[in-house]
């Protein structure tokens, strides 16, 4: 004969564990349904009755199956730094991340509390490395050889161009002069080109730092001993 | 709106049984959730949760009075009955009736009634 | 069975003090905790329940706060009408009354 199937409210068998989506009250003593996503419990389970449940008010959401007696607030509106990348619904909260020239300078649980605007580096100085989503620009002066004469968040250092001849040094923050030397050009003493390299530079850029952390974010879900908490073990 | 009221002796004798009565208005037992529990409050002490029923009749003693506790309702009558057994002096408190949300808090509370016990 | 430690056991404050009651479980309860105020002669009335949900009528002065066995009743500014004596409930596991904390003005 099959096993008989027990349905909630039931005692659990000595030392045993409830089921999938179910929890054990510890005052009834009994195996009680859990509530699905999306829902909350209304009633609790007794020795005789199976826990009872209710949909989520407006502005709430339960994420996993539980038995709360109430649904998690969704957070507050996305600020005007932010852009809103997962809406509030019954099921889940609204997740805020920082828009473009943006990184998230205190993190929450989903997405992100508070954006800061990503530093900018001045002329003569580049970005050592980029920011993430998480992290900010880090600068760094332009070595000899070297110049940056933007204020970006992106421009890293770039080698000056190599002259035959050289009007103007280059500089930390600005690239060098080449005179020209091409007596085919009819052009008063002195003129400069602006500019005329000898060599491709390509041969001289430094690679792009690759990211600190790749960007993305990271999804972390409460797990622990807090049986009913809305982030209790789920399905 | 919800009320609850308490009646019962005011004086009872040593060993006696305790017979206290919650008459309530403005819900009913048989509304599912609904429950009804007992409390009481030694002269100048702390709130002791003495036991519970449920709408479905499901029962909650108190583990530490069990054995001298019985709760019953009276769903047409929108009654509880609390009886206490063997009393003692120590017993000598006022006495509530609470209701009792689906989510287990007490939420609405009976004016109480003072039991003394003494010979 | 859950013990319930509720500290003070009194205190006396200033009108406009920030006033701070815990109630230590002897076992996690996970939020289900409630605290009623209990005014010299009368009934107690229901202020919080799981944890920090405030009963609709309840001045926002008061907050609760906490989570596993550690929980907190917070008078943010204390007024003459809050002279009372407070108590947590657990209904995590059966019902527990803390031992109650009396509040007084200095």
């Known amino acids: 004969l099959p096993a008989q199937v027990a349905f909630t409210p039931y005692a659990p068998e000595p030392g045993g564990t409830c089921r999938l989506r179910e929890y054990y009250d510890q005052t009834a003593q009994m195996c009680c349904s859990k509530c699905p996503p999306g829902q909350h419990a209304k009633v609790f389970c007794t020795k005789t009755s199976d826990t009872v449940c209710d949909s989520c008010e407006d502005s709430t959401y339960t994420q996993l199956w539980n038995w709360v007696p109430e649904c998690l607030s969704c957070g507050s509106r996305c600020s005007s730094d932010q852009v809103e990348t997962q809406a509030c619904t019954r099921e889940q909260n609204r997740i805020c991340t920082c828009r473009p020239g943006w990184y998230c300078a205190l993190s929450k649980q989903e997405g992100c509390r508070l954006c800061a605007q990503l530093r900018k580096c001045r002329p003569g100085f580049g970005v050592a490395r980029p920011g993430t989503e998480t992290s900010d620009v880090v600068c760094k002066p332009c070595a000899p050889g070297t110049f940056s004469n933007t204020t970006s968040s992106t421009d890293i250092c770039r080698p000056h161009q190599i002259c035959h001849v050289v009007a103007i040094p280059g500089n930390a923050s600005m690239d060098a002069v080449c005179t020209s030397t091409s007596p085919t050009r009819s052009m008063a003493p002195g003129a400069v080109h602006l500019p005329q390299p000898v060599s491709t530079r390509s041969q001289h850029t430094q690679p792009t730092p690759a990211p600190s952390t790749a960007p993305g974010t990271s999804f972390l879900l409460p797990v622990g001993p807090s049986p009913p908490a809305e982030g209790s073990t789920g399905d | 709106q919800v009320t609850l009221k308490e009646s019962g002796p005011t004086l009872v004798k040593p060993t006696q049984t305790l017979t206290l009565t919650c008459t309530f208005s403005g819900f009913s037992l048989s509304t599912l959730g609904m429950g009804v529990g007992w409390i009481r409050q030694p002269p100048g002490k702390a709130l002791e949760w003495l036991a519970h029923i449920w709408w479905d009749a499901d029962k909650y003693y108190n583990p530490a009075l069990k054995s001298r506790l019985t709760i019953t309702k009276d769903t047409s009558k929108n009654q509880v009955v609390l009886t206490m057994t063997n009393m003692d002096p120590v017993d000598t408190a006022t006495y509530y009736c609470?209701?009792?949300?689906?989510?287990?808090?007490?939420?609405?509370w009976g004016q109480g009634t003072t039991v003394t016990v003494s010979s | 069975d859950i013990q319930m430690t509720q500290s003070p056991s009194s205190l006396s404050a200033s009108v406009g003090d920030r006033v701070t009651i815990t109630c230590k479980a002897s076992q996690n309860i996970n939020k289900f905790i409630a605290w009623y105020q209990q005014k010299p002669g009368k009934v107690p009335k229901l202020l919080i329940h799981y944890t920090s949900t405030l009963q609709p009528g309840v001045p926002s002065r008061f907050s609760g706060s906490g989570s596993g066995s550690d929980y907190t009743l917070t008078i943010s500014s204390l007024q003459p009408e809050d002279v009372a004596t407070y108590y947590c409930l657990q209904y995590g596991v059966l019902w527990t009354f803390g031992g109650g904390t009396k509040v007084e003005i200095k």
């Open positions: 609470a209701r009792m949300t689906g989510t287990r808090y007490f939420d609405v």
